[in-house]
Interface confidence: medium
């Protein structure tokens, strides 16, 4: 008897075991969240584990499918969207991938009503893009490059553009570079917020220099993939405005809004586009060089059936340290007088914080302020502003909400997520139904992750939406490794960094020692997130350390961190993976002998050089799909961090960043070099360009590359590539397989 | 151009009543909290009394809880302030605000003035 518990506390610690490479690589310990689709105050609709499409009232609590999932079967559907006025739901499949964000699909109307698919004026396919109006059922699509319009889903079309040519002229949609650079989305068309008018762009790509690869198939000859891509000082596309009247789009047709004055005198992107109301649009450009961003606020003219933006309502934003914003501009988000707004800027500080804006960005009220940031603007409603932001004890990676009460005196702060699950979540985003009457909560970490539901009124919590709670059960009787998030102090800088640390984890021994690098500019790589990925595996079954480090040009820490890569790339944010790795050394647990360093895209970059500094400090490295050049990257982001590749700007810069430039510096390391040849972001070329140069300096060194595959490595490349890179790191670090 | 007109100060004895208004103007009126703040020869400029948009929430500093009452009709663009029991310290010049923002007053009336004395 007395004996049992010590038996079963044995035959629990026999029962544990390590996280291994299979695990990851079939996903086993992936967890789920729930974000609602919001279709009321107080009403969402979500798909259920059976794909029938179910809608749920909160103040009822009933819930009743709208769409059962053998109609979603009839068509093979993976995705729905119901128009505002509920009688029809649009079921989208045969979804074809194209870039980031970007796919075609072939689009069903399905007639709520009468429990049929909609016959006559079928959509043609595939189609680019396809969205409701807000209010009511019309329909915006985007085919073959032209924007169409249907007045209700059996209409016949009309057809907005013409001019829409493949890699020529894209209306609706972006271009390569603004998908990916700019707008971050696979649209460039929005609704007024009563479906009155449809606002849209125009990007004219004729005279962009294209980048051609070859995609290789199972075709005798392989084909070639030519995609209109502006590298560094390139010619960039040449975008316009366009905005129609919907109810009687023939009456006048598309009306182009006009460019502030200021940013039209020389080359100039648009970074975004925000309805105010029906009649009201604020639109957002940029100079190429973005350190001046002019937000223009724009009314409808009915005598003239125009648009005319006075220069009294353009609000300038300029940087005097760096670029505008901080990976891209932030949006405004209005308030209910239609002319007032509030937005995210840095103080005079330099901390990106709430501002609201009346009449001039000069007499800005700031409204949060601290050396912490504000990172994005919820919801705003009559009475209250939501927020998030890394306030909360003082940690820079993690995500709390806010709540500032305007409606009542005097105006108070609220934290509404920092003592909820304390241990568990520190790192939230939140979803708002109309006028913020109910949210949901979605905690990524660090602990597993939760979403809940909470009233917007008393921020009380309604239910657990999902908890993942099979995932939990998974993991008792997995070793999992230990992960811990401090700061080190280095000459006036603070470098975060999270440890991953072996689960029996021991001071006294020493251990080899993996890097995991971003280092991008405005990224963040230490947050209080959960994961059970390649890097708990390696700690959790191979016994290394893994680190990763916050430097120079990372966010979310004031300007004079971020801003700090400025027009200098590729030589702070190495700098500082070096120092960390050293103090790291001084901890007295890692084997100096035994130390390697690994990234993928702008990581793969900052490896490379960090094993090419001459240091002597890396064993080995890894880089995946690495950036070698910024004169091989597009312009929009390069330009942004790096000014123009021309003499009179930083093309001394451009030439000296390099990986070719430091070939000779691999002798001494062993470097792994891997890249998809169909990689349409950051192209092969710039592994091309770095073996090419490691073969001149005759420095031996390792290569894979996957064929016909992307910037993202997918399907069963991913398989090969982690098994090929444990392989690689066991064999540097000297790990039996 | 926002408009802001006080009326109804001035002379009264020490325990007496006064009621001020303020018609507001030029502004949409609805979306802004109201306020009346006081000005004593050689002092600073006192909040009083806050009232919300909707006029569901109020404010008053201890100095006058309980004696002022603060009130608006959003119909007529009228805010009001009830002053009870006044005392010889209340001499102020009163002026009625409108914020710009939240709590912010941007904006302010010329000011009435009201004189406590026996």
């Known amino acids: 008897i007395v004996l049992r518990p010590s038996r079963v506390h044995n035959s629990e610690e026999n029962t544990m075991r390590a996280l291994t490479l299979k695990d990851i690589l079939n996903g086993t310990f992936s967890y789920k969240t729930f974000f609602p689709n919001w279709i009321s105050g107080q009403e969402y609709l979500h798909q259920s584990a059976d794909n029938n499409i179910v809608l749920y009232n909160i103040e009822t609590g009933q819930s009743y499918t709208i769409l059962s999932n053998r109609t979603m079967k009839s068509v093979n559907a993976s995705n729905y969207g119901l128009s505002p006025d509920r009688q029809f739901v649009y079921l989208e499949s045969d979804y074809s991938k194209l870039w980031r964000y970007s796919y075609t699909a072939t689009y069903y109307i399905y007639d709520l009503s009468n429990g049929e698919f909609v016959r006559g004026n079928e959509l043609p396919r595939p189609i680019q893009y396809l969205c409701w109006s807000p209010v009511g059922s019309k329909l915006a699509y985007v085919y073959q490059n032209n924007i169409y319009l249907k007045q209700r889903p059996g209409d016949p079309p009309f057809q907005i553009t013409f001019n829409g040519r493949e890699n020529k002229i894209f209306n609706g949609i972006p271009d390569w570079v603004y998908e990916e650079e700019m707008l971050a989305t696979k649209y460039a068309l929005w609704w007024s917020p009563n479906g009155k008018f449809l606002a849209y762009a125009e990007f004219n790509d004729t005279d962009i220099p294209v980048i051609a690869y070859s995609y290789y198939g199972d075709e005798q000859y392989p084909r070639t993939i030519n995609i209109p891509y502006p590298k560094a000082g390139a010619k960039n596309p040449v975008v316009r405005i366009f905005i129609i009247d919907t109810t009687y789009p023939a009456y006048v047709g598309p009306q182009e809004v006009p460019v502030p004055a200021m940013i039209a005198s020389s080359d100039y992107y648009f970074s975004w586009l925000t309805w105010v109301t029906d009649e009201r649009v604020c639109l957002q450009w940029l100079k190429r060089v973005q350190n001046v961003s002019v937000l223009s606020i724009c009314d409808f003219r009915e005598d003239w059936q125009t648009w005319d933006c006075p220069k009294t309502q353009e609000h300038i934003e300029e940087s005097r340290t760096g670029w505008a914003g901080g990976f891209f501009v932030s949006t405004p988000v209005f308030s209910y007088d239609a002319i007032s707004y509030y937005k995210i800027f840095s103080d005079k500080d330099g901390y990106k914080h709430i501002h609201y804006i009346k009449d001039t960005v000069e007499n800005a009220i700031q409204i949060t302020s601290g050396k912490w940031e504000a990172i994005n603007i919820f919801r705003v409603t009559q009475d209250s502003l939501f927020y998030s932001s890394n306030e909360f004890e003082e940690y820079p990676g993690r995500r709390n909400i806010y709540r500032i009460s305007i409606g009542s005196y005097p105006p108070s702060k609220k934290c509404v997520t920092c003592h909820l699950r304390k241990e568990r979540c520190q790192y939230y985003t939140a979803s708002f139904s109309d006028y913020a009457k109910y949210y949901a909560l979605v905690c990524y970490g660090p602990g597993i992750p939760i979403s809940t539901l909470h009233d917007g009124r008393t921020d009380q919590e309604i239910k657990i939406l999902e908890e993942n709670k099979e995932l939990e059960n998974a993991l008792k009787n997995i070793q999992l490794p230990k992960e811990e998030i401090k700061k080190l102090e280095v000459d006036e800088i603070t470098l975060w960094y999270k440890m991953i640390l072996p689960p029996q984890f021991d001071r006294s021994k020493k251990y080899p020692l993996l890097i995991q690098v971003y280092g991008g500019p405005c990224s963040q790589s230490v947050r209080s997130v959960f994961a059970v990925n390649w890097i708990s595996y390696l700690a959790s079954k191979e016994g290394m350390v893994i680190a990763l480090v916050d430097g120079r040009g990372t966010a979310f820490q004031g300007d004079k961190l971020l801003y700090a890569v400025y027009r200098k790339l590729g030589v702070y944010e190495v700098e500082d993976q070096i120092t960390a790795v050293r103090k790291f050394i001084e901890m007295g647990f890692i084997d100096e002998k035994r130390i390697a360093i690994w990234g993928w895209s702008y990581g793969g970059y900052v490896s490379s050089l960090a094993l090419a500094s001459g240091t002597g400090l890396f064993k080995c490295g890894i880089a995946v799909a690495p950036v070698s050049s910024w004169e091989y990257y597009a312009s929009v982001y390069t330009e942004r961090f790096m000014g123009l590749p021309t003499k009179d700007d930083n093309l001394e810069h451009y030439k000296n960043s390099t990986v070719m430039a430091r070939a000779e510096y691999f002798r001494n390391v062993d470097y792994l070099l891997i890249h998809g040849t169909a990689d349409d972001n950051v192209h092969f070329q710039n592994s091309a360009q770095i073996a090419k140069a490691l073969v001149n300096a005759q420095v031996d060194f390792q290569a894979m590359w996957y064929s016909d595959q992307n910037h993202g490595l997918s399907g069963l490349s991913t398989n090969h590539l982690y098994t090929h890179m444990t392989h690689f790191l066991k064999q540097c670090f000297s790990l039996s397989d | 151009e926002v408009q802001l007109v006080e009326s109804g100060g001035g002379l009264v004895q020490p325990g007496g009543s006064l009621r001020l208004s303020c018609a507001a103007s030029g502004f949409i009126y609805g979306y802004n909290h109201m306020g009346w703040f006081r000005q004593a020869p050689g002092k600073g400029r006192e909040l009083v009394a806050a009232?919300?948009?909707?006029?569901?929430?109020?404010y008053y500093p201890d100095s006058v809880e309980g004696r002022f009452t603060i009130s608006r009709d959003n119909a007529k663009r009228m805010v009001y302030l009830q002053m009870n029991s006044l005392r010889a310290e209340d001499t102020a010049v009163y002026y009625c605000?409108?914020?710009?923002?939240?709590?912010?007053?941007?904006?302010w009336g010329q000011g009435t003035q009201v004189t406590v004395s026996s």
């Open positions: 009232i919300s948009r909707t006029g569901g929430s109020t």
């Open positions: 605000a409108a914020a710009e923002f939240q709590w912010h007053f941007g904006y």
